[in-house]
Protein backbone atom coordinates (compact mmCIF):
# COMPACT_ATOMS: atom_id res chain seq x y z
CA UNK A 1 0.00 0.00 0.00
CA UNK A 2 1.33 3.51 -1.35
CA UNK A 3 1.53 6.07 1.16
CA UNK A 4 -1.34 8.65 1.00
CA UNK A 5 -0.60 12.16 -1.18
CA UNK A 6 -2.80 14.20 -1.64
CA UNK A 7 -2.13 15.53 -5.68
CA UNK A 8 -3.32 19.15 -6.68
CA UNK A 9 -1.56 19.40 -9.68
CA UNK A 10 -2.46 22.97 -10.46
CA UNK A 11 -0.85 25.96 -8.02
CA UNK A 12 -2.77 28.21 -10.26
CA UNK A 13 -5.98 28.18 -11.86
CA UNK A 14 -7.04 30.94 -13.81
CA UNK A 15 -11.02 31.46 -14.27
CA UNK A 16 -13.29 34.15 -15.76
CA UNK A 17 -16.07 35.30 -13.68
CA UNK A 18 -19.53 33.62 -14.73
CA UNK A 19 -17.43 30.49 -15.94
CA UNK A 20 -16.93 26.77 -14.09
CA UNK A 21 -13.45 26.17 -12.38
CA UNK A 22 -12.28 22.94 -12.01
CA UNK A 23 -10.32 21.87 -9.04
CA UNK A 24 -8.21 18.93 -9.41
CA UNK A 25 -7.89 16.61 -6.57
CA UNK A 26 -6.43 12.71 -6.60
CA UNK A 27 -5.25 10.78 -3.78
CA UNK A 28 -2.66 8.08 -4.48
CA UNK A 29 -3.98 5.49 -1.77
CA UNK A 30 -7.29 4.63 -0.22
CA UNK A 31 -6.28 4.44 3.58
CA UNK A 32 -6.29 5.89 5.91
CA UNK A 33 -10.06 5.20 6.12
CA UNK A 34 -12.39 8.76 5.83
CA UNK A 35 -13.48 11.51 3.66
CA UNK A 36 -11.49 13.86 1.72
CA UNK A 37 -12.98 17.44 1.66
CA UNK A 38 -12.49 20.70 0.47
CA UNK A 39 -11.26 23.48 2.24
CA UNK A 40 -10.83 27.46 1.03
CA UNK A 41 -7.84 29.26 3.15
CA UNK A 42 -6.22 27.71 5.83
CA UNK A 43 -5.98 27.70 9.86
CA UNK A 44 -9.42 27.93 12.17
CA UNK A 45 -10.82 30.60 9.62
CA UNK A 46 -10.99 28.65 6.83
CA UNK A 47 -13.89 28.09 4.62
CA UNK A 48 -15.81 24.76 4.15
CA UNK A 49 -16.71 24.25 0.41
CA UNK A 50 -17.34 20.77 0.10
CA UNK A 51 -18.45 17.96 2.26
CA UNK A 52 -19.51 15.23 0.33
CA UNK A 53 -21.42 14.00 3.75
CA UNK A 54 -23.00 16.56 5.00
CA UNK A 55 -24.11 20.19 4.35
CA UNK A 56 -25.54 22.20 1.09
CA UNK A 57 -23.11 22.95 -1.66
CA UNK A 58 -25.57 24.19 -4.54
CA UNK A 59 -22.45 25.48 -6.65
CA UNK A 60 -20.25 22.27 -6.05
CA UNK A 61 -20.09 19.28 -8.30
CA UNK A 62 -18.06 16.36 -8.30
CA UNK A 63 -16.23 15.35 -11.39
CA UNK A 64 -16.08 11.78 -10.49
CA UNK A 65 -18.82 9.27 -8.14
CA UNK A 66 -17.67 9.34 -4.97
CA UNK A 67 -19.59 6.70 -3.68
CA UNK A 68 -17.76 4.39 -5.96
CA UNK A 69 -15.69 1.81 -3.82
CA UNK A 70 -12.04 2.39 -5.37
CA UNK A 71 -12.32 6.44 -5.69
CA UNK A 72 -9.38 8.38 -5.54
CA UNK A 73 -10.56 11.34 -7.53
CA UNK A 74 -11.65 14.08 -5.73
CA UNK A 75 -11.64 16.81 -7.99
CA UNK A 76 -15.02 19.31 -7.94
CA UNK A 77 -16.32 22.07 -10.24
CA UNK A 78 -17.60 25.56 -8.68
CA UNK A 79 -19.88 27.11 -11.08
CA UNK A 80 -20.73 30.62 -11.71
CA UNK A 81 -17.67 32.08 -10.30
CA UNK A 82 -17.47 35.84 -8.49
CA UNK A 83 -14.92 37.97 -7.81
CA UNK A 84 -15.31 36.61 -4.31
CA UNK A 85 -14.09 32.91 -5.12
CA UNK A 86 -10.88 33.53 -5.41
CA UNK A 87 -8.30 32.38 -2.80
CA UNK A 88 -6.43 29.10 -2.52
CA UNK A 89 -8.29 25.85 -1.76
CA UNK A 90 -7.14 22.92 -0.12
CA UNK A 91 -8.19 19.07 -0.61
CA UNK A 92 -8.36 17.82 2.89
CA UNK A 93 -7.99 14.45 3.76
CA UNK A 94 -9.62 13.96 7.49
CA UNK A 95 -9.06 10.00 9.21
CA UNK A 96 -12.98 8.37 10.00
CA UNK A 97 -12.99 9.02 13.75
CA UNK A 98 -15.37 8.55 16.80
CA UNK A 99 -16.68 11.43 18.30
CA UNK A 100 -15.29 12.94 15.51
CA UNK A 101 -12.74 12.77 12.06
CA UNK A 102 -9.57 13.92 12.72
CA UNK A 103 -7.55 15.72 9.79
CA UNK A 104 -4.76 13.55 7.96
CA UNK A 105 -3.28 15.35 5.24
CA UNK A 106 -3.96 18.35 3.45
CA UNK A 107 -2.85 18.88 -0.87
CA UNK A 108 -0.87 21.59 -1.82
CA UNK A 109 -3.37 24.32 -2.38
CA UNK A 110 -4.55 25.67 -5.64
CA UNK A 111 -4.55 28.87 -5.90
CA UNK A 112 -7.70 30.34 -7.85
CA UNK A 113 -7.31 33.66 -9.27
CA UNK A 114 -9.48 35.54 -11.72
CA UNK A 115 -8.04 35.39 -15.46
CA UNK A 116 -8.36 38.32 -17.88
CA UNK A 117 -6.74 38.06 -21.26
CA UNK A 118 -5.06 40.95 -22.47
CA UNK A 119 -6.03 43.07 -25.80
CA UNK A 120 -4.59 42.41 -29.26
CA UNK A 121 -1.40 44.24 -28.93
CA UNK A 122 -1.16 47.29 -31.48
CA UNK A 123 1.98 48.62 -32.68
CA UNK A 124 2.03 52.09 -33.37
CA UNK A 125 5.20 53.43 -35.35
CA UNK A 126 6.95 56.67 -35.90
CA UNK A 127 4.89 59.40 -36.97
CA UNK A 128 7.47 61.19 -39.20
CA UNK A 129 9.38 58.58 -42.21
CA UNK A 130 13.02 57.99 -41.86
CA UNK A 131 15.71 56.77 -44.32
CA UNK A 132 18.11 53.75 -44.23
CA UNK A 133 20.27 53.17 -41.87
CA UNK A 134 18.71 55.47 -39.41
CA UNK A 135 16.85 54.18 -36.29
CA UNK A 136 13.23 54.20 -35.48
CA UNK A 137 11.04 53.40 -32.68
CA UNK A 138 7.82 50.93 -32.17
CA UNK A 139 5.33 51.27 -29.50
CA UNK A 140 2.97 48.20 -28.49
CA UNK A 141 0.88 48.51 -26.35
CA UNK A 142 -1.72 45.53 -24.59
CA UNK A 143 -4.47 46.27 -21.73
CA UNK A 144 -6.66 44.64 -19.43
CA UNK A 145 -5.15 41.51 -18.39
CA UNK A 146 -4.24 39.47 -14.87
CA UNK A 147 -2.01 38.49 -13.53
CA UNK A 148 0.46 40.51 -14.17
CA UNK A 149 3.03 37.74 -15.64
CA UNK A 150 3.46 37.96 -19.07
CA UNK A 151 5.77 37.50 -21.81
CA UNK A 152 6.51 40.59 -24.55
CA UNK A 153 8.58 39.54 -28.01
CA UNK A 154 9.28 41.99 -31.22
CA UNK A 155 10.24 40.30 -33.78
CA UNK A 156 11.17 42.02 -37.83
CA UNK A 157 10.65 39.57 -40.58
CA UNK A 158 11.15 36.43 -38.20
CA UNK A 159 14.01 37.68 -36.58
CA UNK A 160 13.69 38.48 -32.71
CA UNK A 161 15.01 41.41 -31.58
CA UNK A 162 16.75 42.71 -28.59
CA UNK A 163 17.00 46.30 -28.56
CA UNK A 164 13.56 47.11 -26.73
CA UNK A 165 12.31 48.03 -23.14
CA UNK A 166 9.16 47.18 -21.98
CA UNK A 167 6.84 48.04 -18.63
CA UNK A 168 4.26 46.48 -17.00
CA UNK A 169 1.35 48.62 -14.98
CA UNK A 170 0.79 49.34 -12.06
CA UNK A 171 3.54 47.59 -10.00
CA UNK A 172 1.20 46.67 -7.19
CA UNK A 173 -1.53 44.86 -7.02
CA UNK A 174 -4.58 45.58 -9.63
CA UNK A 175 -7.83 43.50 -10.99
CA UNK A 176 -5.73 44.39 -14.30
CA UNK A 177 -2.51 45.28 -15.56
CA UNK A 178 -1.41 47.29 -19.16
CA UNK A 179 2.17 46.59 -20.70
CA UNK A 180 3.70 48.75 -23.28
CA UNK A 181 7.23 48.44 -25.11
CA UNK A 182 9.18 50.27 -27.12
CA UNK A 183 11.80 48.79 -29.83
CA UNK A 184 14.51 50.96 -31.51
CA UNK A 185 14.91 49.04 -35.08
CA UNK A 186 17.39 49.99 -37.84
CA UNK A 187 16.24 50.80 -41.02
CA UNK A 188 17.59 48.40 -44.01
CA UNK A 189 17.03 49.57 -47.49
CA UNK A 190 14.96 46.83 -48.54
CA UNK A 191 12.92 47.32 -45.45
CA UNK A 192 9.71 48.29 -47.58
CA UNK A 193 8.40 44.58 -47.34
CA UNK A 194 9.33 44.18 -43.81
CA UNK A 195 7.09 44.22 -41.06
CA UNK A 196 7.67 44.55 -37.17
CA UNK A 197 5.52 42.24 -34.79
CA UNK A 198 4.94 42.12 -30.84
CA UNK A 199 3.98 38.95 -29.22
CA UNK A 200 2.29 38.83 -26.21
CA UNK A 201 1.75 35.10 -24.56
CA UNK A 202 0.41 35.21 -21.70
CA UNK A 203 -1.42 32.24 -19.29
CA UNK A 204 -4.97 32.81 -20.20
CA UNK A 205 -4.01 32.38 -23.66
CA UNK A 206 -3.24 28.74 -23.45
CA UNK A 207 -0.18 28.91 -25.44
CA UNK A 208 -1.49 30.90 -28.11
CA UNK A 209 0.10 34.67 -28.40
CA UNK A 210 -1.34 37.69 -29.26
CA UNK A 211 0.40 38.96 -32.18
CA UNK A 212 0.23 43.08 -33.88
CA UNK A 213 2.09 44.03 -36.31
CA UNK A 214 3.32 47.19 -38.05
CA UNK A 215 4.61 47.71 -41.86
CA UNK A 216 7.81 49.20 -42.03
CA UNK A 217 6.50 50.88 -45.23
CA UNK A 218 5.02 53.46 -42.76
CA UNK A 219 8.30 54.19 -41.98
CA UNK A 220 10.77 54.33 -43.88
CA UNK A 221 11.63 56.80 -47.01
CA UNK A 222 13.88 55.27 -49.49
CA UNK A 223 15.12 58.50 -51.27
CA UNK A 224 15.98 58.16 -55.23
CA UNK A 225 18.92 58.21 -57.41
CA UNK A 226 18.36 59.93 -60.62
CA UNK A 227 20.03 59.48 -64.06
CA UNK A 228 19.81 61.90 -66.77
CA UNK A 229 20.49 60.29 -70.56
CA UNK A 230 20.18 61.45 -73.88
CA UNK A 231 19.33 59.34 -76.17
CA UNK A 232 21.84 58.33 -79.32
CA UNK A 233 19.53 58.74 -82.54
CA UNK A 234 17.91 61.85 -82.57
CA UNK A 235 14.59 62.19 -84.62
CA UNK A 236 14.21 64.88 -87.05
CA UNK A 237 14.38 67.92 -84.83
CA UNK A 238 14.20 66.28 -81.85
CA UNK A 239 16.36 64.73 -79.23
CA UNK A 240 14.41 62.49 -76.57
CA UNK A 241 16.16 62.93 -72.88
CA UNK A 242 15.47 60.35 -70.14
CA UNK A 243 15.58 60.95 -66.63
CA UNK A 244 15.29 57.85 -64.40
CA UNK A 245 14.08 57.98 -60.36
CA UNK A 246 15.66 54.58 -59.14
CA UNK A 247 14.56 52.92 -56.19
CA UNK A 248 12.39 55.43 -54.23
CA UNK A 249 9.61 54.95 -51.63
CA UNK A 250 7.15 56.25 -51.63
CA UNK A 251 5.25 56.82 -54.42
CA UNK A 252 4.58 60.00 -54.23
CA UNK A 253 6.73 62.12 -56.53
CA UNK A 254 6.97 65.60 -58.65
CA UNK A 255 9.31 65.51 -61.52
CA UNK A 256 9.33 68.30 -63.78
CA UNK A 257 12.36 69.56 -66.40
CA UNK A 258 13.64 72.78 -66.89
CA UNK A 259 15.15 74.08 -70.80
CA UNK A 260 18.44 76.64 -69.48
CA UNK A 261 16.63 77.14 -66.08
CA UNK A 262 13.37 78.03 -68.05
CA UNK A 263 10.26 74.81 -66.32
CA UNK A 264 8.34 73.11 -69.38
CA UNK A 265 5.17 73.13 -68.88
CA UNK A 266 4.17 70.94 -72.06
CA UNK A 267 3.14 67.16 -71.07
CA UNK A 268 5.95 64.29 -71.12
CA UNK A 269 6.07 60.60 -71.08
CA UNK A 270 6.61 58.78 -68.30
CA UNK A 271 5.99 54.67 -66.98
CA UNK A 272 6.12 53.77 -62.95
CA UNK A 273 7.26 50.37 -62.16
CA UNK A 274 7.39 48.50 -59.24
CA UNK A 275 10.45 46.71 -58.20
CA UNK A 276 10.87 43.32 -55.88
CA UNK A 277 11.74 44.99 -52.82
CA UNK A 278 8.69 47.43 -52.92
CA UNK A 279 10.43 50.99 -53.94
CA UNK A 280 9.49 52.27 -57.24
CA UNK A 281 11.32 53.14 -60.42
CA UNK A 282 9.87 55.89 -62.26
CA UNK A 283 11.07 56.85 -66.11
CA UNK A 284 10.38 60.58 -67.66
CA UNK A 285 11.13 60.97 -71.57
CA UNK A 286 11.72 64.69 -72.56
CA UNK A 287 11.56 65.67 -76.38
CA UNK A 288 14.06 68.87 -77.28
CA UNK A 289 13.23 70.76 -80.35
CA UNK A 290 17.15 71.38 -81.68
CA UNK A 291 18.19 73.46 -84.39
CA UNK A 292 21.24 74.17 -86.23
CA UNK A 293 21.20 77.97 -84.76
CA UNK A 294 20.21 77.24 -81.33
CA UNK A 295 22.58 77.46 -78.83
CA UNK A 296 23.81 74.79 -76.50
CA UNK A 297 20.57 73.20 -74.03
CA UNK A 298 21.06 72.74 -70.87
CA UNK A 299 17.79 70.22 -69.53
CA UNK A 300 17.68 69.91 -65.97
CA UNK A 301 15.36 66.66 -64.16
CA UNK A 302 13.90 67.80 -60.73
CA UNK A 303 12.33 65.36 -58.39
CA UNK A 304 10.79 66.24 -55.18
CA UNK A 305 9.84 63.23 -53.27
CA UNK A 306 7.27 62.86 -50.69
CA UNK A 307 7.95 66.39 -49.51
CA UNK A 308 11.73 66.08 -49.24
CA UNK A 309 14.13 68.99 -50.80
CA UNK A 310 14.30 69.13 -54.50
CA UNK A 311 16.81 66.84 -56.17
CA UNK A 312 18.53 67.43 -59.83
CA UNK A 313 20.32 66.34 -62.59
CA UNK A 314 21.56 68.19 -65.46
CA UNK A 315 22.41 67.39 -69.36
CA UNK A 316 24.05 69.60 -71.43
CA UNK A 317 23.17 69.03 -74.68
CA UNK A 318 25.68 70.22 -77.53
CA UNK A 319 23.95 71.16 -80.67
CA UNK A 320 25.83 70.74 -84.17
CA UNK A 321 24.99 69.26 -87.23
CA UNK A 322 26.54 66.50 -86.21
CA UNK A 323 25.39 65.57 -82.32
CA UNK A 324 28.63 65.36 -80.31
CA UNK A 325 28.73 63.08 -77.04
CA UNK A 326 26.82 63.90 -74.39
CA UNK A 327 27.86 65.11 -70.65
CA UNK A 328 26.43 65.90 -67.77
CA UNK A 329 26.75 66.40 -64.47
CA UNK A 330 24.28 66.78 -61.11
CA UNK A 331 22.98 69.62 -58.96
CA UNK A 332 22.21 68.97 -55.31
CA UNK B 1 16.31 -0.89 7.29
CA UNK B 2 13.64 1.18 9.33
CA UNK B 3 15.01 1.72 12.89
CA UNK B 4 13.11 3.35 15.84
CA UNK B 5 14.96 3.69 18.42
CA UNK B 6 13.15 5.19 21.81
CA UNK B 7 14.77 6.73 24.94
CA UNK B 8 15.66 4.72 28.01
CA UNK B 9 13.14 4.11 31.39
CA UNK B 10 11.93 6.24 33.46
CA UNK B 11 10.94 6.88 37.02
CA UNK B 12 8.74 9.45 38.02
CA UNK B 13 6.63 10.41 40.81
CA UNK B 14 2.51 11.06 40.94
CA UNK B 15 1.69 14.51 39.60
CA UNK B 16 5.03 14.68 37.20
CA UNK B 17 5.03 14.44 33.14
CA UNK B 18 7.15 12.73 31.71
CA UNK B 19 8.89 12.72 27.94
CA UNK B 20 9.43 10.01 25.54
CA UNK B 21 11.44 10.01 22.56
CA UNK B 22 11.55 8.34 19.33
CA UNK B 23 13.86 8.74 16.73
CA UNK B 24 13.34 6.97 13.30
CA UNK B 25 15.97 6.16 10.58
CA UNK B 26 16.78 4.42 7.45
CA UNK B 27 13.11 5.83 5.90
CA UNK B 28 11.61 9.08 4.78
CA UNK B 29 10.84 10.69 8.17
CA UNK B 30 7.80 13.09 6.56
CA UNK B 31 6.04 10.38 4.91
CA UNK B 32 4.75 8.45 7.54
CA UNK B 33 3.00 9.17 10.88
CA UNK B 34 3.61 7.73 14.28
CA UNK B 35 1.43 6.17 16.58
CA UNK B 36 1.93 6.01 20.88
CA UNK B 37 0.70 2.64 21.89
CA UNK B 38 1.04 1.83 25.71
CA UNK B 39 1.26 -1.64 27.65
CA UNK B 40 0.45 -1.56 31.06
CA UNK B 41 1.92 -5.11 33.19
CA UNK B 42 0.60 -8.14 32.03
CA UNK B 43 -2.40 -6.43 29.85
CA UNK B 44 -3.07 -5.62 26.34
CA UNK B 45 -2.37 -2.91 23.80
CA UNK B 46 -3.88 0.45 23.81
CA UNK B 47 -3.49 3.08 21.48
CA UNK B 48 -2.92 6.85 22.72
CA UNK B 49 -3.15 9.28 19.66
CA UNK B 50 -1.23 9.69 16.54
CA UNK B 51 1.16 12.78 14.57
CA UNK B 52 1.98 13.86 11.18
CA UNK B 53 5.78 14.86 10.87
CA UNK B 54 4.42 16.63 7.61
CA UNK B 55 2.00 18.54 8.69
CA UNK B 56 2.42 18.70 12.55
CA UNK B 57 -1.46 17.61 12.26
CA UNK B 58 -2.34 15.10 15.98
CA UNK B 59 -5.16 13.15 17.16
CA UNK B 60 -5.62 11.79 20.56
CA UNK B 61 -7.71 8.59 21.95
CA UNK B 62 -10.10 10.70 24.60
CA UNK B 63 -9.03 8.78 27.58
CA UNK B 64 -5.70 11.17 26.92
CA UNK B 65 -6.88 13.73 25.52
CA UNK B 66 -5.53 17.05 27.91
CA UNK B 67 -3.04 15.32 29.31
CA UNK B 68 -1.11 14.18 25.88
CA UNK B 69 0.83 16.02 23.74
CA UNK B 70 2.78 14.85 20.81
CA UNK B 71 5.37 16.88 19.11
CA UNK B 72 8.12 16.61 16.10
CA UNK B 73 11.76 17.59 15.50
CA UNK B 74 12.00 16.98 11.43
CA UNK B 75 15.61 18.28 12.01
CA UNK B 76 16.53 15.14 13.70
CA UNK B 77 13.86 12.76 12.46
CA UNK B 78 12.68 12.36 16.32
CA UNK B 79 8.71 12.26 17.70
CA UNK B 80 7.82 13.11 20.97
CA UNK B 81 5.03 11.66 23.59
CA UNK B 82 4.50 13.47 26.59
CA UNK B 83 2.28 12.97 29.31
CA UNK B 84 1.57 14.97 32.24
CA UNK B 85 -0.09 14.73 36.00
CA UNK B 86 1.40 11.19 35.69
CA UNK B 87 -1.08 8.93 38.00
CA UNK B 88 0.50 4.86 39.66
CA UNK B 89 -2.18 3.33 36.62
CA UNK B 90 0.12 5.30 33.69
CA UNK B 91 3.16 2.87 34.88
CA UNK B 92 3.49 1.17 31.42
CA UNK B 93 5.83 0.12 28.66
CA UNK B 94 4.89 3.32 25.88
CA UNK B 95 6.12 2.32 22.35
CA UNK B 96 6.24 4.13 19.44
CA UNK B 97 5.33 3.28 16.03
CA UNK B 98 6.10 3.53 12.45
CA UNK B 99 2.00 4.12 10.57
CA UNK B 100 1.58 2.60 7.50
CA UNK B 101 -0.91 3.86 5.14
CA UNK B 102 -1.77 6.29 8.15
CA UNK B 103 -3.37 2.85 9.35
CA UNK B 104 -1.14 0.16 10.54
CA UNK B 105 2.19 -0.56 12.25
CA UNK B 106 4.66 -1.96 10.10
CA UNK B 107 7.73 -0.71 12.36
CA UNK B 108 7.86 -0.40 16.29
CA UNK B 109 10.01 1.19 18.66
CA UNK B 110 11.93 -1.98 21.62
CA UNK B 111 9.39 0.55 24.47
CA UNK B 112 10.48 2.68 27.41
CA UNK B 113 9.13 1.57 30.61
CA UNK B 114 7.93 4.65 32.40
CA UNK B 115 7.48 3.24 36.04
CA UNK B 116 4.85 5.89 38.05
CA UNK B 117 5.58 5.45 41.90
CA UNK B 118 5.59 7.42 45.05
CA UNK C 1 -15.45 3.50 19.68
CA UNK C 2 -15.02 0.41 18.33
CA UNK C 3 -14.89 -2.39 20.72
CA UNK C 4 -12.29 -5.53 19.41
CA UNK C 5 -13.07 -8.74 21.79
CA UNK C 6 -10.49 -11.46 20.97
CA UNK C 7 -11.23 -15.36 21.44
CA UNK C 8 -10.31 -17.54 23.07
CA UNK C 9 -8.17 -15.47 25.45
CA UNK C 10 -6.02 -18.46 25.74
CA UNK C 11 -5.63 -21.06 23.03
CA UNK C 12 -3.37 -24.73 23.76
CA UNK C 13 -2.11 -26.29 20.67
CA UNK C 14 0.79 -29.03 19.86
CA UNK C 15 3.40 -28.19 17.42
CA UNK C 16 2.80 -28.99 13.57
CA UNK C 17 -1.30 -28.47 14.49
CA UNK C 18 -3.30 -25.75 12.90
CA UNK C 19 -4.69 -23.00 15.41
CA UNK C 20 -7.51 -20.60 14.76
CA UNK C 21 -7.76 -17.05 16.73
CA UNK C 22 -10.91 -15.32 16.28
CA UNK C 23 -11.67 -11.54 16.27
CA UNK C 24 -14.78 -9.82 16.53
CA UNK C 25 -15.58 -6.11 15.88
CA UNK C 26 -18.43 -4.34 17.69
CA UNK C 27 -19.45 -2.55 14.67
CA UNK C 28 -18.45 -2.80 10.73
CA UNK C 29 -14.88 -2.04 10.15
CA UNK C 30 -14.88 -3.21 6.44
CA UNK C 31 -11.58 -5.40 5.93
CA UNK C 32 -9.56 -2.96 7.76
CA UNK C 33 -7.96 -5.09 10.30
CA UNK C 34 -4.62 -6.00 11.19
CA UNK C 35 -3.05 -8.75 13.18
CA UNK C 36 0.25 -8.53 15.41
CA UNK C 37 1.86 -11.48 17.38
CA UNK C 38 4.18 -10.06 20.70
CA UNK C 39 6.75 -12.33 22.22
CA UNK C 40 7.79 -11.48 26.17
CA UNK C 41 9.85 -8.34 26.64
CA UNK C 42 9.65 -7.47 22.86
CA UNK C 43 7.81 -5.13 20.51
CA UNK C 44 4.75 -6.41 18.62
CA UNK C 45 5.26 -7.57 14.89
CA UNK C 46 3.01 -6.77 12.21
CA UNK C 47 1.78 -10.19 10.34
CA UNK C 48 -1.39 -9.63 8.18
CA UNK C 49 -3.02 -5.72 7.11
CA UNK C 50 -6.13 -5.51 5.34
CA UNK C 51 -7.75 -8.60 7.03
CA UNK C 52 -5.57 -11.10 4.92
CA UNK C 53 -2.30 -9.56 3.47
CA UNK C 54 0.87 -10.63 4.84
CA UNK C 55 3.30 -8.44 5.91
CA UNK C 56 6.84 -8.72 4.12
CA UNK C 57 8.71 -11.63 5.56
CA UNK C 58 5.80 -13.31 7.06
CA UNK C 59 5.50 -16.75 6.73
CA UNK C 60 2.50 -18.68 4.40
CA UNK C 61 1.70 -20.34 7.21
CA UNK C 62 -0.04 -17.07 8.55
CA UNK C 63 -3.15 -16.21 6.91
CA UNK C 64 -5.90 -13.95 7.59
CA UNK C 65 -10.16 -13.79 6.90
CA UNK C 66 -12.94 -12.18 7.19
CA UNK C 67 -14.99 -8.92 6.76
CA UNK C 68 -17.33 -6.57 8.59
CA UNK C 69 -17.29 -7.50 12.08
CA UNK C 70 -15.93 -10.96 12.36
CA UNK C 71 -12.06 -12.23 11.73
CA UNK C 72 -9.81 -15.25 11.73
CA UNK C 73 -6.33 -15.50 11.93
CA UNK C 74 -5.07 -19.11 10.91
CA UNK C 75 -1.54 -20.53 11.73
CA UNK C 76 -1.74 -24.16 9.02
CA UNK C 77 1.20 -25.48 10.91
CA UNK C 78 2.86 -24.39 14.27
CA UNK C 79 6.24 -23.85 15.21
CA UNK C 80 7.69 -23.47 18.29
CA UNK C 81 8.63 -19.93 17.06
CA UNK C 82 4.98 -19.26 16.84
CA UNK C 83 3.65 -19.44 20.41
CA UNK C 84 3.09 -16.07 21.73
CA UNK C 85 0.56 -13.42 22.30
CA UNK C 86 -1.32 -12.22 18.67
CA UNK C 87 -3.38 -8.93 18.82
CA UNK C 88 -6.25 -7.67 16.13
CA UNK C 89 -6.22 -3.84 15.70
CA UNK C 90 -8.96 -2.46 13.37
CA UNK C 91 -8.02 1.13 11.79
CA UNK C 92 -11.76 1.51 10.30
CA UNK C 93 -12.05 4.40 12.69
CA UNK C 94 -10.42 6.26 15.07
CA UNK C 95 -9.65 5.82 17.94
CA UNK C 96 -7.54 2.73 16.64
CA UNK C 97 -8.41 -0.20 18.81
CA UNK C 98 -6.97 -3.46 19.40
CA UNK C 99 -8.26 -6.78 21.24
CA UNK C 100 -7.14 -7.71 24.53
CA UNK C 101 -4.93 -10.76 22.98
CA UNK C 102 -5.39 -14.17 22.63
CA UNK C 103 -2.33 -16.04 24.30
CA UNK C 104 -0.98 -19.08 22.44
CA UNK C 105 0.98 -21.82 23.85
CA UNK C 106 2.22 -25.07 23.70
CA UNK C 107 -0.34 -28.22 24.40
Known amino acids: EEELQMIQPEKLLLVTVGKTATLHCTVTSLLPVGPVLWFRGVGPGRELIYNQKEGHFPRVTTVSDLTKRNNMDFSIRISSITPADVGTYYCVKFRKGSPENVEFKSGPGTEMALGAKPSAPVVLGPAARTTPEHTVSFTCESHGFSPRDITLKWFKNGNELSDFQTNVDPTGQSVAYSIRSTARVVLDPWDVRSQVICEVAHVTLQGDPLRGTANLSEAIRVPPTLEVTQQPMRVGNQVNVTCQVRKFYPQSLQLTWSENGNVCQRETASTLTENKDGTYNWTSWFLVNISDQRDDVVLTCQVKHDGQLAVSKRLALEVTVHQKDQSSDATP | QVQLVQSGAEVKKPGASVKVSCKASGGTFSNYGFSWVRQAPGQGLEWMGWMSPSSGNTGYAQKFQGRVTMTRDTSTSTVYMELSSLRSEDTAVYYC???????????WGQGTLVTVSS | EIVMTQSPATLSVSPGERATLSCRAS??????LAWYQQKPGQAPRLLIYGTSTRATGIPARFSGSGSGTEFTLTISSLQSEDFAVYYCQQYGSLPFTFGQGTRLEIK
Open chain 3, 27 to 32: QSVSSY
Open chain 2, 97 to 107: ARERSGSYFDY
